[in-house]
Interface confidence: low
């Protein structure tokens, strides 16, 4: 006869690993005992259990508790045992040691590999701005048995760079994500993807991009200069920009203070029936905790009982 | 075939939470985003949020404070809630489903959510 | 917000017409814009991704062309079944739709 068991045997963390020994025997022949021992390279044999045709099993002190039988039905020639909620510990060399009548005896090794799958964590760079070169984005960290795959799923242009960390039992993987910060990368998502064999399938986490950023200023509402004549209602500025936090707006007036009667309603600038008294330069200034923009326009109220056009600066400053 | 399908009460009284749900079949949602677009009867879209299969969001900011979207993804089904609800939210709401740049391959039929006392 | 301004907001045209929609970005976009056709009752279908791609199953008379704040929608000979609204849309940052374009039978 001959012992039939597989070389390794591969059982996530935390899983019942089966460790299989059956006895492929003559007709006739019939197993007394089995013997199961730990027998790692260097260590010596520790027993695990002992399988007897007659008594049953019994189980040594260090692993009360953790050995049992497959559940019925048994085949009598079966020496397989369950070695319960397997730990990084439990991996290494087991041996079967069968005794048969009349043939004797025969031993068979196997190999037990306890998968540990990682736990990923994904933890986000500093603050992105646009104009930064370039950035750490994020870095993903996995820890397993064996080691862990990290990669980044994306298309946001980057580069990526990778490290590891072997522990007695286990290894960790850092995967660090860097890119050069632009303002159309607000809102595109950055997935790190952690591969293992001890994981049904790829775990990901998703990290949002954000871009503190904060466009141009410009002034609207000086298109048609016809429009800002003595008596106008209606008459306002807005201030256009965009950024990320969103900005804030305020407005002055360079050549002096604003005059009654005008309302600042956040990016807007309103003005009461117009009179000469509204011309002026007038500034709104655009800022979020990034940066700050200024732009300004000359408002020049026409009387129309004048003639002359009048002409209209715009200029952009930051 | 990628389907998403809309579900939810057709009727909310004002200022109450408007609450949706979007079932995805025929496929994996994983790696794609899941988003919520409405249209007001007769005028154009507006998008509202997105939520990613590892459970990230990104709302719009002009509802932020009034839209929250969950996932359950053992189920492939979205949720929408949109609180304190006026006249103004009646639309027919879309699921639609993105890759990783936020337009829109497969959308839902729509559910039209009419806000009336 | 970024604004999408589309033009024009209605149009009416003939089978076989070459039609042309245009889209304005208030600031770059790159190429970051989808268009959409919608018909009525029924959810919009993605014609055109990142401004020139042509969707899966789309006719190619239909093509999309520019970059940074104006695009074009373009159906090089009008089919009766292409008479719907269609929507143009960005998607850099929070995405926003143009008003429409309503493609109607002369």
């Known amino acids: 006869g001959e012992l039939e068991t597989s070389d390794v045997v591969t059982v996530v963390l935390g899983q019942d690993a089966k460790l299989p020994c059956f006895y492929r025997g003559d007709s006739g022949e019939q197993v007394g005992q089995v013997a199961w021992a730990r027998v790692d390279a260097g260590e010596g044999a520790q027993e695990l259990a002992l399988l007897h045709s007659k008594y049953g099993l019994h189980v040594s002190p260090a692993y009360e508790g953790r050995v049992e039988q497959p559940p019925p039905p048994r085949n009598p020639l079966d020496g397989s045992v369950l070695l319960r909620n397997a730990v990084q510990a439990d991996e290494g060399e087991y041996e079967c040691r069968v005794s048969t009548f009349p043939a004797g005896s025969f031993q068979a090794r196997l190999r037990l590999r306890v998968l540990v799958p990682p736990l990923p964590s994904l933890n986000p760079g500093p603050a992105l701005e646009e104009g930064q070169g370039l950035t750490l984005a994020a870095s993903c960290t996995a820890e397993g048995s064996p080691a862990p795959s990290v990669t980044w799923d994306t298309e946001v242009k980057g580069t990526t760079s990778s490290r590891s960390f072997k522990h007695s039992r286990s290894a960790a993987v850092t995967s660090e994500f860097h890119l050069v910060p632009s303002r159309s990368m607000n809102g595109q998502p950055l997935t790190c993807v952690v591969s293992h064999p001890g994981l049904l399938q790829d775990q990901r986490i998703t990290h949002i991009l954000h871009v503190s950023f904060l466009a141009e200023a410009s002034v609207r509402g000086l298109e048609d200069q016809n429009l800002w004549h003595i008596g106008r209602e209606g008459a306002m500025l807005k201030c256009l920009s965009e950024g990320q936090p969103p900005p804030s707006y305020n407005w002055t007036r360079l050549d002096g203070p604003l005059p009654s009667g005008v309302r600042v309603d956040g990016d807007t600038l309103g003005f009461p029936p117009l009179t000469t008294e509204h011309s002026g330069i007038y500034v709104c200034h655009v800022s979020n905790e990034f940066s700050s923009r200024d732009s300004q326009v000359t408002v020049d109220v026409l009387d129309p009982q004048e003639d002359s056009g009048k002409q209209v600066d715009l200029v952009s400053a930051s | 075939q990628v389907q998403l399908q809309e579900s939810g009460p057709g009727l909310v009284k004002p200022s109450e939470t408007l609450s949706l749900t979007c079932t995805v079949s025929g496929g994996s949602i994983t790696n794609y985003g899941v988003h919520w677009i409405r249209q007001p009867p007769g005028k154009g879209l507006e998008w509202l949020g997105v939520?990613?299969?590892?459970?990230?969001?990104d709302y719009n900011p002009s509802l932020k404070s009034r839209v929250t979207i969950s996932v359950d993804t053992s189920k492939n089904q979205f949720s929408l809630k949109l609180s304190s609800v006026t006249a103004a939210d009646t639309a027919v709401y879309y699921c639609a489903r993105s890759g990783k740049w936020y337009y829109f391959d497969y959308w839902g039929q729509g559910t039209l959510v009419t806000v009336s006392s | 917000d970024i604004q999408m301004t589309q033009s024009p907001s209605s149009l009416s045209a003939s089978v076989g017409d070459r039609v042309t929609i245009t889209c304005r970005a208030s600031q770059s976009i790159y190429s970051n814009l989808a268009w959409y056709q919608q018909k009525p009752g029924k959810a919009p279908k993605l014609l055109v991704y990142?401004?020139?791609n042509l969707a899966s199953g789309v006719p190619s008379r239909f093509s999309g062309s520019g970059s940074g704040t104006d695009f074009t929608l373009t159906i090089s000979s009008l089919q009766p079944e292409d008479f719907a609204t269609y929507y143009c849309q960005h998607f850099w940052g929070t995405p926003t739709f143009g008003g429409g374009t309503k493609v109607e039978i002369k």
């Open positions: 990142a401004a020139t």
């Open positions: 939520i990613w299969s590892g459970g990230s969001t």
